[in-house]
Interface confidence: low
């Protein structure tokens, strides 16, 4: 015997209170597949979120972040403040990268300059807060470990997971 609910299309739900007839999803809710017994509540985009795609009866709303913030996490589950290149975000706000580190993006953390000597190379262009050093070929008589800026800390990857 076929389940009568299987005939209910996306955008409706199988209403047990009305002899399992297909009722449209109420306002601010949706069902993205057929045969659903309830509709899901639409996501709201509040605070530093803004609406990227409105909710419809068949698909959820999608949020992104207001200017000055960027998404973190699957489906933009939270927003993190942008900083300038050469800065990283702390709880007190955006702070300049310490000497020996750089950040070439508006997000993430300051990372140590490349240690050219580890590859037997010399520093061709010095690093800045915004840019990594540029390594060049080893100069004559160069021995690894003699011509480089030592990074102050190991590199770390910025977090991009749900809060």
């Amino acid at each position: 015997l076929q389940d009568p609910c299987s005939n209910c299309p996306a955008g409706t739900f199988c209403d047990n209170n009305r002899n399992q007839i297909c009722s449209p999803c109420p306002p601010n809710s949706f069902s993205s597949a057929g045969g659903q017994r309830t509709c899901d509540i639409c996501r709201q985009c509040k605070g530093v979120f803004r609406t990227r795609k409105e909710c419809s009866s068949t698909s959820n709303a999608e949020c992104d972040c207001t200017p000055g913030f960027h998404c973190l996490g699957a489906g933009c589950s939270m927003c993190e403040q942008d900083c300038k290149q050469g800065q990283e975000l702390t709880k007190k706000g955006c702070k300049d990268c310490c000497f020996g580190t750089f950040n070439d993006q508006k997000r993430g953390i300051c990372r140590p300059w490349t240690n050219c000597s580890l590859d037997g190379k010399s520093v061709l262009v010095n690093g800045t807060k915004e840019r990594d050093v540029v390594c060049g070929p080893a100069s004559a008589g160069f021995s690894p470990g003699t011509s480089s800026v030592t990074p102050p800390a190991p590199a770390r990857e910025p977090g991009h997971s749900p809060q």
Epitope: G47, G73, G159, H160, P162
Partner: antibody, heavy 118, light 107 residues
Framework: QVQLVESGGGLVQPGGSLRLSCAAS????????MHWVRQAPGKGLEWVSV????????YYADSVKGRFTISRDNSKNTLYLQMNSLRAEDTAVYYC???????????WGQGTLVTVSS | DIELTQPPSVSVAPGQTARISCSGD??????VSWYQQKPGQAPVLVIY???ERPSGIPERFSGSNSGNTATLTISGTQAEDEADYYC??????????FGGGTKLTVL
């Protein structure tokens, strides 16, 4: 199912240190920001700190900044809170929590009591 | 950070409706969650995203949020609802803010 189990609480003298641990299970630990929230005896909830899934980003309440350090070991599914220069006002039950963020439910541990007293 | 203000206590007769307020500057533009906490237990989420109920939370719990006030409403209050209730505000960014808590007494 999701489980968070705190440990490491106890009695410590003012100025002392303590490290709390929170063992997580039942979900992909490294996918989630994790929080510490505390509650002084007879008082309300106070957010303390949060750490990103990879451990690279950390944030603190002003009341603990410079004294507490949040960290995690994703290979052990464990969250930590290193507490230094402890004060009497840090006496509280400390909860490890995965707090709601749009799509995921809230999960809290049962808490571990930290008492700072001479 | 926003400061959230709750009444220290609210009393209600069994079967009646309890309303607990949470005030904060333009709180309606932020997400509000509500927690129930019974003595010696961890907090339990009862409302999230202003008005959504997690699975397992009775239908008598509902929430609203607009302007400068969010409200937790418990219709047909039962003795087992006696607990402390905390609001929490979140604007989508990193840190969280909790209200001071309200002790609900069922007379």
């Amino acid at each position: 199912q999701v489980q968070l189990v705190e440990s490491g609480g106890g009695l410590v003298q003012p100025g002392g240190s303590l490290r709390l641990s929170c063992a997580a299970s039942g979900f992909t630990f490294s996918d989630y920001y994790m929080h510490w929230v505390r509650q002084a005896p007879g008082k309300g909830l106070e957010w303390v700190s949060v750490i990103s899934g990879s451990g690279s980003n950390t944030y603190y309440a002003d009341s603990v900044k410079g004294r507490f350090t949040i960290s995690r070991d994703n290979s052990k599914n464990t969250l930590y809170l290193q507490m230094n220069s402890l004060r009497a006002e840090d006496t509280a039950v400390y909860y490890c929590a995965r707090l709601y963020a749009q799509f995921e439910g809230d999960f809290w541990g049962q808490g571990t009591l930290v008492t700072v007293s001479s | 950070d926003i400061e959230l203000t709750q009444p220290p206590s609210v009393s209600v007769a069994p079967g009646q409706t309890a309303r607990i307020s949470c005030s904060g500057d333009n709180i309606g533009s932020k997400y509000v969650s509500w927690y129930q906490q019974k003595p010696g237990q961890a907090p339990v989420l009862v409302i999230y995203s202003d008005s959504e109920r997690p699975s397992g939370i009775p239908e008598r719990f509902s929430g609203s949020n607009s302007g400068n006030t969010a409200t937790l409403t418990i219709s047909g209050t039962q003795a087992e609802d006696e607990a402390d209730y905390y609001c929490q505000s979140w604007d989508g960014s990193i840190s969280r803010v909790f209200g001071g808590g309200t002790k609900l007494t069922v007379l």
